[in-house]
């Protein structure tokens, strides 16, 4: 008969830039050897070869050298494929073909996602506003995938649907920048909120602007930065937003713009003497030169590292002087936990087993929760350790010691507190003598 190949029913959701595991398994017969295995991963639609194992050896990646098998697990029937540094273009269906004597196949869907940045809000005009003025509020959120849903509401939570224009443009990597424009007539004062929703991640990013019509005070330069920390994934680029309102007649030669680390006063980037003086921070920063004249003093920080986390101060001088600090919160998603059992054979009710849940390369430190099959939290006999690697990313290992009942399911949830990302794994142990992982 046909070989039974098992893959997850639901799409595998992977964040851009992270690694994804496309799970595929089969049940080897007694006496199975890897020399008998013929394993092919293909793109379902185009039939393009992705990775193969044949003639007793891994034939390697045929997909931009970004795929790998799990060679130590193949003999147990684990034909899963690791796809590294996921891109938008990877989205779609992958088919896992397994032949030993018989043949079987199954397709697994990869859904790519990228969180949208906290929206930045701009106002035009942004000075000397009075009740009755018509203003254009622009809500911009960047580098997300797939296309976002955008919602506006006023300070009372009433949806604003009229006079809204939303555009979404994909960059070279396929990530979308969303710009939504609301035109509104000012009342005495008002709060306007914009919510950008990622439909796959069910991630909502929102910002609001409160407008109190009045004359702007003169004197110090008003420097505006986001109130909330800017959250950036390790390895991606982050924009630290900073803006000011240039006076009529402003020229870039008048601008003195300094970005510093708030605590150490270390210079990060500067624009002085009419020109960009460049990055003083490992050549990983850039301004937006075409936008400076409009008052956009934002800083682009490339290839974010854990060590970048902290507060950055934007100092702006034209004639007057102003400054504001913006916080960078670095994050990295935790991998789907792997579960191991010790002992893992001939288990019987009453045995004490150690279940280890391991999740890798996340930041900041994770929160780990255990529960049984009924959803009851398990807090006793849990030991969790987290260790940072050279890049500052954490590997988390949580160990649960439990006495087996007739049967039971044990779930481990690893939560990234910044991304509000939950990664979970579970193991089900049945009452009869068994081996883990199950052979059928």
């Amino acid at each position: 008969g046909a070989l039974e190949v098992q893959v997850p029913e639901d799409p595998v959701v992977a964040l851009v830039g992270t690694d994804a595991t496309l799970c595929c398994s089969f049940s080897p017969e007694p006496g199975f050897s890897l020399a008998q295995l013929n394993l092919i991963w293909q793109l379902t639609d185009t039939k393009q070869l992705v990775h193969s194992f044949a003639e007793g050896q891994d034939q390697g990646s045929a997909y931009a050298n970004r795929t790998a098998l799990f060679p130590d697990l193949l003999a147990q029937g684990n034909a899963s494929l690791r796809l590294q540094r996921v891109r938008v273009a990877d989205e779609g269906s992958f088919t896992c073909f397994v032949s030993i004597r018989d043949f079987g196949s199954a397709a697994v869907s990869l859904q790519v996602a990228a969180p949208y940045s906290k929206p930045s809000m701009t106002l035009e005009p942004n000075k000397d506003l009075r009740p009755g003025d018509t203003v254009t509020i622009t809500c911009s959120s960047y580098q997300g995938y797939p296309e976002a849903e955008v919602f506006w509401q006023d300070g009372q939570g009433v949806p604003l649907t009229g006079n809204v224009t939303t555009s979404q443009m994909a960059n070279e990597q396929g990530l979308f920048d969303v710009h939504s424009i609301l035109r509104v007539v000012l009342g005495a004062n008002g709060t306007y909120s914009c919510l950008v929703r990622n439909p796959v991640l069910q991630q909502d990013a929102h910002s609001s602007v409160t407008i109190t019509p009045q004359r702007s005070p003169t004197g110090a330069v008003e420097v505006q930065v986001p109130e909330d920390p800017v959250v950036a994934l390790v390895g991606t680029d982050a924009t630290l937003r900073c803006s000011f309102s240039p006076e009529p007649g402003f020229s870039l030669a008048q601008l003195n713009l300094i970005w510093q680390l708030t605590d150490t006063k270390q210079l990060v980037h500067s624009f002085t003497e009419g020109r960009d003086q460049g990055s003083a921070y490992a050549n990983r920063t850039a301004l937006f030169p075409d936008l400076l004249a409009q008052g956009n003093a934002s800083l682009r920080l490339q290839r974010v590292r854990v060590a970048d986390e902290g507060s950055f101060t934007c100092f702006v001088s034209i004639r007057d002087f102003g400054s504001a600090a913006v916080s960078l919160q670095v994050a990295a998603p935790y991998s789907k936990p792997s579960m191991t059992l010790e002992p893992n054979k001939d288990l019987r009710p009453g045995d004490t087993v150690t279940i280890t849940c391991s999740s890798y390369r996340g930041y900041p430190e994770a929160e780990v929760f255990w529960q049984d099959g009924q959803g009851v939290p398990l807090t006793g006999n849990v030991t969790t350790s987290q260790m940072a690697n050279e890049q500052g990313l954490f590997d988390v290992h949580s160990v649960l010691r439990v006495v087996l009942g007739a049967n039971g399911t044990y779930s481990c949830l690893v939560r990234n507190p910044v991304l509000q990302q939950d990664a979970h794994g579970s193991v089900t142990i049945t009452g009869q003598p068994m081996t883990f992982p199950p052979e059928a």
Epitope: G249, A253, Q254, N256, I258, Q260, S270, S317, R319, F321
Partner: antibody, heavy 116, light 107 residues
Framework: QVQLQESGPGLVQPSGTLSLTCAVS?????????WTWVRQSPGQGLEWIGE???????SYSPSLRSRVTISVDKSKTQFSLKLSSVTAADTAVYYC?????????WGQGTLVTVSS | EIVMTQSPATLSVSPGERATLSCRAS??????LAWYQQKPGQAPRLLIY???TRATGIPDRFSGSGSGTEFTLTISSLESEDFAVYYC?????????FGQGTRLEIK
């Protein structure tokens, strides 16, 4: 009312270093104000020398950049100018001023002569 | 750098009359121009900034006009204390530069 007062030696040897201090009084805060030096050669026009920001960041005239240093001492509410390798061409009245771009508050100026 | 040229070098006008001083920039400085008055033994005094905005405490007989490369300082009715040297200064491009001055003397 903001007051600025320059002080320093009136005579400097050629190839020596000119050092001037500007004392600030009357409520100007060095943590929010820029400070500027301007000079005026005898019978000549005004020349902008350089400026220092509230966080100690400096910009200098291209023609003087290699020889000039401006610094600020916040605790003493004063800022200073150093000009090295001076020649007779550096003989001038040196003014300190508050702010940048254009200047509403000036010191009364101090004449520095470069001569042996 | 931008060169500021003032004309005339010396202007002789009688008290009570109007004086018109000119300043030309070697390239556009938008409206980023200031005018100063300097008397012997004194520091310059800011009169006008933004080409036409009077500084605090400056009498309204002083007015500035122009944009781009051509600017004018007008003193509508000269008083005795107005006889001095006048400088224009641009702050549109780096570095800041001053004109060579116009001496306003009593006719």
């Amino acid at each position: 009312q903001v007051q600025l007062q320059e002080s320093g030696p009136g005579l400097v040897q050629p190839s020596g270093t000119l050092s001037l201090t500007c004392a600030v009084s009357g409520g100007s805060d060095s943590s929010t104000n820029w400070w500027t030096w301007v000079r005026q050669s005898p019978g000549q026009g005004l020349e902008w020398i350089g400026e220092i920001s509230p966080i100690g960041f400096t910009s200098y005239s291209p023609s003087l950049r290699s020889r000039v240093t401006i610094s600020v001492d916040k605790s003493k509410t004063q800022f200073s100018l150093k000009l090295s390798s001076v020649t007779a061409a550096d003989t001038a009245v040196y003014y300190c001023a508050r702010d940048r771009l254009y200047f509403a508050f000036w010191g009364q100026g101090t004449l520095v002569t470069v001569s042996s | 750098e931008i060169v500021m040229t003032q004309s005339p070098a010396t202007l002789s006008v009688s008290p009570g009359e109007r004086a018109t001083l000119s300043c030309r920039a070697s390239q556009s400085v938008s409206s980023n121009l200031a005018w100063y008055q300097q008397k012997p033994g004194q520091a310059p005094r800011l009169l006008i900034y933004g080409a036409s905005t009077r500084a605090t405490g400056i009498p309204d007989r002083f007015s500035g006009s122009g944009s781009g490369t051509e600017f004018t300082l007008t003193i509508s009715s000269l008083e005795s204390e107005d006889f001095a040297v006048y400088y224009c200064q641009q702050y549109n491009n780096w570095p800041i530069t001053f004109g060579q001055g116009t001496r306003l003397e009593i006719k």
